[in-house]
């Protein structure tokens, strides 16, 4: 699986999950998030050669098409597969609120 | 929606579905598919600016991150959203077989 366990331990050029730390205030301008200051959102990148973690029949077909037609601009793209939520603390006036934001952390990638 | 109705009628630079005809024999080397000879598989391409058909909270965050950090390599990617099946005819020996291959035709795209 193209997950953090594999990708963070290997120098993988092809599609894999990459570490990306996002600081809410500095990187997003989100001053309203009090906790955490930031988090590892991670991201997916790298080429998608034929059959590499193909998401659908279409991505398999497109991968083969791209292999046999290297000049073609059409190829699968490395995108998030499994995502996890992130719990944040913010304030509404003086009232603290805790919310779980869904699909915030990329745990694995796929070629789609 | 970034679907064929919209994308095929507009000169859209950003993430959209693009027409792509694939000939089974010539483009994939699949001699075993007898009907159809080929089909419009289509594909997704184009930049994913902030908030453009964002698939998840992560793609929204990543889009904003990329807007505020233009030098960053991390950005959402334009990938298939809705796909449709394709019915094919092939032969096993002298016996004709008809099969519906799932997720073969891209009908719309998203930023993921």
């Amino acid at each position: 699986a193209l997950d953090t366990n594999y990708c963070f331990r290997n120098l993988e050029e092809n599609c894999c999950v990459r570490p990306l730390y996002i600081d809410f205030r500095q990187d997003l301008g989100w001053k309203w998030v009090h906790e955490p200051k930031g988090y590892y959102a991670n991201f997916c990148s790298g080429p998608c050669p034929y059959l590499r973690s193909a998401d659908t029949t279409h991505s398999t077909v497109l991968g083969l098409y791209n292999t046999l037609n290297p000049e073609a601009s059409a190829s699968p793209c490395c995108v998030p597969q499994d995502l996890e939520p992130l719990t944040i603390l913010y304030y509404v006036g003086r009232t603290p609120k805790v919310e779980q934001l869904s699909n915030m952390v990329v745990k694995s990638c796929k070629c789609s | 929606a970034l679907d064929t109705n919209y994308c095929f009628r507009n000169l859209e630079e950003n993430c959209c579905v693009r027409p792509l005809y694939i000939d089974f024999r010539q483009d994939l080397g699949w001699k075993w598919v007898h009907e159809p000879k080929g089909y419009y598989a289509n594909f997704c391409s184009g930049p994913c600016p902030y908030l453009r058909s964002a698939d998840t909270t992560h793609s929204t965050v990543l889009g904003l991150y990329n807007t505020l950090n233009p030098e960053a390599s991390a950005s959402p990617c334009c990938v298939p959203q809705d796909l449709e099946p394709l019915t094919i005819l092939y032969y096993v020996g002298r016996t004709p077989k008809v099969e519906q291959l799932s997720n073969m035709v891209v009908k719309s795209c998203k930023c993921s």
Epitope: - | K31, H34, G93, R94, V98
Partner: antibody
Amino acid sequence: EVQLLESGGGLVQPGGSLRLSCAASGFDFNSYGMSWVRQAPGKGLELVADIVSKTYNYTTYYSDSVKDRFTISRDDSKSTVYLQMNSLRAEDTAVYYCTVAPGGSFDYWGQGTLVTVSS
Amino acid sequence: DIQLTQSPSSLSASVGDRVTITCRASQSVSISRFNLMHWYQHKPGKQPKLLIYRASNLASGVPSRFSGSGSGTDFTLTISSLQPEDFATYYCQHSRESPWTFGGGTKVEIK
């Protein structure tokens, strides 16, 4: 260009034997089924024998009229298909065509070889 | 086995005529939207030639005056404007199941 060249036809007495050969070129012989189709004088086309590719275990078919007397075989290394005809009868007199069916249709045909069974 | 019955067994026509030949199968030779019927032209002393595959697809190099239609059990070969070189015997053939079989043929003669 696809070419199918039959040979081995001729005059033979009833009860005798003949072996027809069909040398193929211009296509991926190993991938496709091969057939023998005949036309007897004043009659229509009849599929006599058929052999599919190695992928499908060289499965064979014979028409009822030739079953247990004719044997179809192929040598993929020589791109050749054969029809061994034993216990020949007068009603086997016909032009025998070698043909290839990549799908459900017989796309290419040889020029035919005449088999005459007569005493 | 699936039997194919062609009609007429022979016909006389003139150059320029529109000619229609039918082929009826003893059971359906269609599967899903695919119609597994094919048509051939056979001239004396020559090998048969594929004209139409899968009911309506023109084989390579075949003039557009030839067309095919039909589904299920009933199929038609049409020559829109008969030419001198079209006088021949025409056969249908199915590939719905093994064994594949041919129709009895339709001989097109000069009137």
